[in-house]
Interface confidence: medium
């Protein structure tokens, strides 16, 4: 394990509230409560970095859940793999985030003999707010029915504490489920994995899905990488050493926006992570006067922005006064450039008043940390030369 400059590594039990998808149930976002059972997942003795907040942390005690409808408890040992984002799962509550967790049966495309000797489950965990997402494949040994405790619906043996004991043999994770990058910049889409000794890495595949179309972006198999999207790179050395399958996309265009799927296939298992990549382009603003007539018209040109949503506000400030919002602006038709960015113009009839006034066109857009504005002074006709 790595040695951090500060803090100590400590092994803790990470307990998560989950749902177990019932066998044969339709798995998806709209699964009904009848299709899912309550479950708990206990990741046993996960090494996490203790920043001092784990002092009163106690390990999971089995059999303490006295409820009418007790959840199925999965105990998963992580001795065979690494869970690098365990801290995020552990501290989610404290940082005001939620962890969603769904467990489902995982079926191997293996011979009947192998399948009869063990059962597999997949656990998908996601930290809200764009945090990490982890997919685990857990294996439970299947033993004979003369065990004292047996789960009737799972058809699996239970430990003396009434839990289903499993070992995590494979995990695929991303640190960020959603990313935003500026048009033209370079993006790195994070995808890491860890597998039990004895498993071999077979392939890595990155796919992009956007507006109903799907396409291969990059594939690595049998030691050979192939970029379908020009410039896409994945560092083969990192695959073997760091178990890092992150994808780098240089020179982002609007066509790169969408849902990326990182799929890792080993000799036994396959799992994936989904990452949403959003492209942004910041607007540019120009403010000018249409004419120098009695009531001049101000034109605010806004160009080169993406995505579409933009808010334009006008304010007027007389000398010595405070800015006041002005209504009555009109908009030109929206234009889209070859690159996919948008442009629009907003116009406003200016009323300079007796002493003149400063007009500001302010643009608010998701790509901007703060609104972008352009101001210009409009003087009364008698003061113009």
């Amino acid at each position: 394990k790595p040695h951090p400059a500060e803090g100590q590594w400590r092994a803790v039990d990470v307990v998560l509230d989950c749902f177990l998808a019932k066998d044969g149930a339709h798995r998806g976002a709209l699964a009904s409560s009848e299709d899912r059972a309550r479950a708990s997942l206990v990741l046993k003795q996960v090494p996490v970095l203790d920043d001092g907040s784990l002092e009163d942390f106690t390990d999971f005690q089995g059999g303490t859940l006295a409820q009418d409808d007790p959840p199925i408890i999965f105990e998963a040992s992580v001795d065979l793999v690494q869970i690098p984002q365990a801290e995020a799962l552990l501290h989610a509550d404290c940082s005001g985030k939620e962890v969603t967790c769904e467990i489902s049966r995982y079926f191997l495309q293996m011979t009947e003999t192998t399948v009869k000797t063990a059962a597999w489950f997949m656990a998908n965990m996601q930290v809200s707010g764009g945090g990490p997402s982890i997919s685990l494949v857990m294996k439970t040994p299947r033993v004979t029915k003369n065990e004292a405790l047996w789960h009737p619906t799972l058809n699996l043996p239970l430990s003396p504490q009434g839990t289903v004991r499993t070992a995590v043999e494979f995990q695929v994770m991303t640190q960020t489920q959603s990313l935003s990058f500026l048009l033209g910049s370079s993006a790195s889409l994070d995808c890491g994995f860890s597998m039990a000794p004895g498993l071999d890495l077979i392939s890595v595949e990155w796919r992009l899905q956007h507006k109903g179309r799907g396409q291969l972006v990059y594939s690595w198999t049998a030691g050979q990488g192939q970029a379908v999207r020009k410039g896409a790179t994945l560092e083969p050395a990192q695959l073997g050493m760091a178990r890092d399958a992150s994808l780098t996309l240089p020179g982002l265009t609007i066509q790169d926006e969408g849902t990326y799927i990182c799929q890792i296939t080993t000799s036994l298992y396959r799992a994936q992570q989904i990452i949403q990549l959003n492209i942004q382009a910041s607007p540019k603003v120009r403010l000018s006067l249409a004419n120098e007539a009695l009531l001049p018209t101000l034109i605010c040109d806004i160009a080169g922005y993406y995505p579409l949503d933009v808010v334009v506000t006008w304010t007027r400030e007389e000398l010595g006064g405070s800015p006041a919002q002005v209504s009555g602006a009109s908009f030109s038709s929206l234009r889209q450039s070859v690159a996919g960015t948008y442009s629009i113009s907003s116009s406003l009839t200016a009323e300079p008043g007796s002493a003149g006034a400063t007009y500001t066109c302010q643009v608010t857009h998701i790509s901007l940390e703060e609104p972008l504005g352009a101001s210009t002074q409009v003087v009364p006709p008698e003061r113009r030369t």
């Epitope: 910041s282 120009r286 000018s288 504005g373």
Partner: antibody, heavy 117, light 106 residues
Framework: DVQLQESGPGLVKPSQTLSLTCSVT?????????WHWIRQFPGNKLEWMGY???????NYNPSLKNRISITHDSSKNQFFLNLNSVTAEDTATYFC??????????WGQGTLVTVSA | ENVLTQSPAIMSASPGEKVTMTCSAS?????MHWYQQKSSTSPKLWIY???KLASGVPGRFSGSGSGNSYSLTISSMEAEDVATYYC?????????FGSGTKLEIK
Amino acid sequence: DVQLQESGPGLVKPSQTLSLTCSVTGYSLTSGYFWHWIRQFPGNKLEWMGYISYSGTTNYNPSLKNRISITHDSSKNQFFLNLNSVTAEDTATYFCAGDDWDWFAYWGQGTLVTVSA
Amino acid sequence: ENVLTQSPAIMSASPGEKVTMTCSASSSVNYMHWYQQKSSTSPKLWIYDTSKLASGVPGRFSGSGSGNSYSLTISSMEAEDVATYYCFQGSGYPLTFGSGTKLEIK
């Protein structure tokens, strides 16, 4: 390729009007760019004077607002600078420039204007 | 108006040396742009939108910064980089230029 060329008198008397023309080739003035006048004083300080947009709208530097006028003639693909009531302080090299939202991507070669009696 | 202060005013560097010049704005701006001007020629757009290189600009040039503080860096000085570099802001009117950094070669 967009090209700009300044022309006009190299010597102007104080209190008179400085008039310069910028001829644009390779792009139509009304197609979507912004067309600026910028000057560089003898000490190399650069000053933005103002622009006229593709739609004919204008914006001027407040320090020149009462003296400056920028117009265009789309039929000749030219835009113009008029600066009245000039003084010796207006002695500078005057550049016309065009931009496609990426500020002054295209420049003329500049023309030196001396204000002197 | 937004005053842009460039430093140093004059600097010299040996071939291969890393060069960094800065531009400080009296008011925060969204982007900074840079122009290169060689003697007796018009300025050329060199870096726009803080960090994007204009067409034909060598990859040894880079731009960075945010808010009130921006910089232009040359990773390895070459003789052809001798020029005056001006920063420029287009976020607020009037549009303003910095006073320039004159880069010489040792």
